[in-house]
């Protein structure tokens, strides 16, 4: 049974040209996190954090994505095209897969950055189904 909950930074905004931290946190489960995938709104992968092997930043984002803090991701040199949904996918054993959603709005104006931290519903599957493409699961 999947008991975990994903907490994310929720809906956040940041200035064009600035940077933002995308954070997810898995709680209420003893499951072992084997890998976290960070994915963009168009289903392109930004980064992988493998528990054993460390980080891999995908080449399309190599100049403006930095790993961390923690299992989070720092997105730099923001453009208006970065506005949209971001997903963290936690692969865990024995629970299976948990997924969190963050919505980032990149602002032209000098509106101050803010973040609303809140709990979102989890989306989970049995571990045996991990062959499925996780990016087929939408909110």
């Amino acid at each position: 049974m999947m008991t975990g909950t994903i907490e994310t930074t929720g809906n956040i905004s940041a200035k064009k040209g600035g940077s933002v931290i995308l954070q997810c946190h898995l709680s209420s489960t003893m499951a072992q996190v084997t890998q976290v995938n960070w994915e963009q709104h168009d289903h392109s992968l930004l980064a992988i954090r493998n528990a054993e092997l460390g980080w891999h930043i995908y080449p399309a984002f190599k100049d403006r994505v930095a790993p961390g803090p923690g299992l989070g991701l720092t997105l730099q040199s923001l453009t208006m095209n970065d506005t949209g949904e971001y997903f963290c996918t936690y692969h865990t054993y024995p629970d299976g897969t948990y997924r969190g959603r963050i919505f980032l709005e990149v602002l032209e104006s000098s509106v101050a950055e803010h973040s609303a931290r809140f709990q979102i519903p989890i989306e989970g599957r049995d571990y045996k189904d991990d062959d499925d493409k996780h990016h087929h699961h939408h909110h």
């Epitope: 493998n50 092997l53 399309a60 190599k62 493409k133």
Partner: antibody, heavy 121, light 106 residues
Framework: EVQLVESGGGLVKPGGSLRLSCAAS????????MSWVRQAPGKGLEWVGR??????????DYAAPVKGRFTISRDDSKNTLYLQMNSLKTEDTAVYCC????????????WGQGTLVTVSS | PYELTQAPSVSVSPGQAASITCSGD??????ACWYQQKPGQSPVLVIY???KRPSGIPERFSGSNSGNTATLTISGTQAMDEADYYC?????????FGGGTKLTVL
């Protein structure tokens, strides 16, 4: 120590099939993205295709010359990578090597010696 | 299909720096890797993710990648560096090798 050992090569007639295997050891195979690369006699390196880890969908990508004829699969429980080659052509003659895609700093292992596939009538 | 172009051959004197280039459309948006292959041997990865060196590869090997060109530089080239060098463009959907450059140490 990271080790990759390919097997299954041999002589096959045009239009025939062959299945290559790659036995991996010394690392957690299930974490790795794995590719097949080939080298025809006296020629350069040519990427054949790859399979991603299951935590990245387990999806496959292929080079245009082999798409629709070759299939890459993996058995993480056996630490083994496979290349099923169908409708073989003479131009598929090459040494076939399995390789670890260089995603991670601590997993950039050596290549195996490869296995020779000869397609000839 | 995506293509990478390498010069067929490069010559260098011992102790000098050798530069081997690889060009491809928007190559800087992908990761460039470099492989060294000596006669009768399997290729060895010498640079990955543009500029990273695997453990065991000497510091004289370095790499860069921007725009349409990736460059492998060998500073203080030694006779043992004579080999074929292949560039590779790597991203999450495809992988392509260049045609290879034969490095001759005069």
């Amino acid at each position: 120590e990271v080790q990759l050992v390919e097997s299954g090569g041999g002589l096959v007639k045009p239009g025939g099939s062959l299945r290559l295997s790659c036995a991996a050891s010394g690392f957690t195979f299930s974490n790795a993205w794995m590719s097949w690369v080939r080298q025809a006699p006296g020629k350069g390196l040519e990427w054949v295709g790859r399979i991603k880890s299951k935590t990245n969908g387990g999806t496959t990508d292929y080079a245009a010359p082999v798409k629709g004829r070759f299939t890459i699969s993996r058995d993480d429980s056996k630490n083994t990578l496979y290349l099923q080659m169908n409708s073989l052509k003479t131009e598929d003659t090459a040494v076939y090597c399995c390789t670890i895609d260089p995603l991670y700093d601590i997993l950039t292992g050596p290549w195996g010696q490869g296995t020779l596939v000869t397609v000839s009538s | 299909p995506y293509e990478l172009t390498q010069a067929p051959s490069v010559s260098v004197s011992p102790g000098q720096a050798a530069s081997i280039t690889c060009s491809g459309d928007k190559l800087g948006d992908k990761y460039a890797c470099w492989y060294q292959q000596k006669p009768g041997q399997s290729p060895v990865l010498v640079i990955y993710q543009d500029s990273k060196r695997p453990s065991g590869i000497p510091e004289r090997f370095s790499g860069s990648n921007s725009g349409n060109t990736a460059t492998l530089t060998i500073s203080g080239t030694q006779a043992m560096d004579e080999a074929d060098y292949y560039c590779q463009a790597w991203d999450s959907s495809t992988v392509v090798f260049g045609g290879g450059t034969k490095l001759t140490v005069l």
